[in-house]
Amino acid sequence: SEVEYRAEVGQNAYLPCFYTPAAPGNLVPVCWGKGACPAFECGNVVLRTDERDVNYWTSRYWLNGDFRKGDVSLTIENVTLADSGIYCCRIQIPGIMNDEKFNLKLVIKPAKVTPAPTRQRDFTAAFPRMLTTRGHGPAETQTLGSLPDINLTQISTLANELRDSRLANDLRDSGATIRIG
């Protein structure tokens, strides 16, 4: 079930999505798309970053935060009822089936007569993810030094989303362990 965010017609909508680069400049490609996250990539891409910069965007969609620090939250300017729906934030960690994907539901309400705040953040506390690695069995020679050194912080209101997240599974598959703190 998607986390729900609300905005009013004519205002700006804010959809949170974060990760924490292991070091400044160690960015991960990110895409935002309209519609639920497909198996790979983003459908109907509205904005995309690469390892250095925002390399694709469409009008009214922009990143207001510091994406170089992992704040890839999407701002949609001057929303209309047509902007309602599911949006996909995909943190494209290199590797097979390694992406972290979040579906966020945007609900647009008709404008009230009285002015409302320009941004509403309907989310609760962040869950930082601390990643620690352990060795493989004797049959494995490749070390986890090749894993992208990324700590992700998911903004979520549902603890089970954290437990079932893609990154958690894939890091576990890789021989890494995750401590949620």
């Epitope: 390892e51 590797g95 894993l147 598959d173």
Partner: antibody
Framework: QVQLQQSGGGLVQPGGSLRLSCAAS????????MSWVRQAPGKGLEWVSG????????YNADSVKGRFTISRDNSKNTLFLQMNSLRAEDTAVYYC???????????WGQGTLVTVSS | EIVMTQSPDSLAVSLGERATINCKSS????????????LAWYQQKPGQPPKLLIY???TRESGVPNRFSGSGSGTDFTLTISSLQAEDVAVYYC?????????FGQGTKVEIK
């Protein structure tokens, strides 16, 4: 030593179903992501489906989406591919493959031939 | 998805001679944060499953003879067999594991001239 023993291939009519199995030994299946890769006669390799170690996340190629389901029984150390609504173009040798980390395929099963024909 | 293109499709080389296979990706598979190219090479002999030869562009899998080497970065990669042996007759595939579904090149068949 790591081994992947496959079974379940055969001849099936278009629209039919088949279930492939891949029994793993020499490692703990639940610790690794796994995939199915196929190879049509005389052709190259095509990734079909993948699953996380926990089994909580699955991915499929567009060509099999909605028809093939990858699953695993970690207690039996076995990987499965349920293939429904089979088409002639699904005819191929199917390989199960262990994914090292989230990266390359370091071990492969021996392959099992699936023939879809009337 | 990333498209992988190999050249040539087939290659005939005399025993003891050098064989070179090229692989080109439709977009870069270099992740600048760890300076790694997410590319592997596999060898497939007739009637057998593929066998991992090289990963991270140039790291040989355990047990692979050192006559096999990989090089390249970004979008252009090369597998070299420095001195072709009879047992090297096979089809060779490159594969990217950088993003999207993992994709393979169409394969290069290496034969003895």
């Amino acid at each position: 030593q790591v081994q992947l023993q496959q079974s379940g291939g055969g001849l099936v009519q278009p629209g039919g179903s088949l279930r492939l199995s891949c029994a793993a030994s020499g490692f703990t299946l639940s610790s690794y992501a796994m995939s199915w890769v196929r190879q049509a006669p005389g052709k190259g390799l095509e990734w079909v489906s993948g699953i996380s170690g926990s089994g909580g996340s699955t991915y499929n190629a567009d060509s099999v989406k909605g028809r093939f389901t990858i699953s695993r029984d970690n207690s039996k150390n076995t990987l499965f591919l349920q293939m429904n609504s089979l088409r002639a173009e699904d005819t191929a040798v199917y390989y199960c493959a262990k994914i090292f980390g989230s990266y390359y395929f370091d071990y492969w099963g021996q392959g099992t031939l699936v023939t879809v024909s009337s | 998805e990333i498209v992988m293109t190999q050249s040539p499709d087939s290659l005939a080389v005399s025993l003891g001679e050098r064989a070179t296979i090229n692989c080109k990706s439709s977009q870069s598979v270099l992740y600048s944060s760890n300076n790694k190219n997410y590319l592997a090479w596999y060898q497939q002999k007739p009637g057998q499953p593929p066998k991992l030869l090289i990963y991270w562009t140039s790291t040989r899998e355990s047990g692979v003879p050192n006559r096999f080497s990989g090089s390249g970065s970004g979008t252009d990669f090369t597998l070299t067999i420095s001195s072709l042996q009879a047992e090297d007759v096979a089809v060779y595939y490159c594969q990217q594991y950088y993003s999207g579904p993992p994709t393979f090149g169409q394969g290069t068949k290496v034969e003895i001239k």
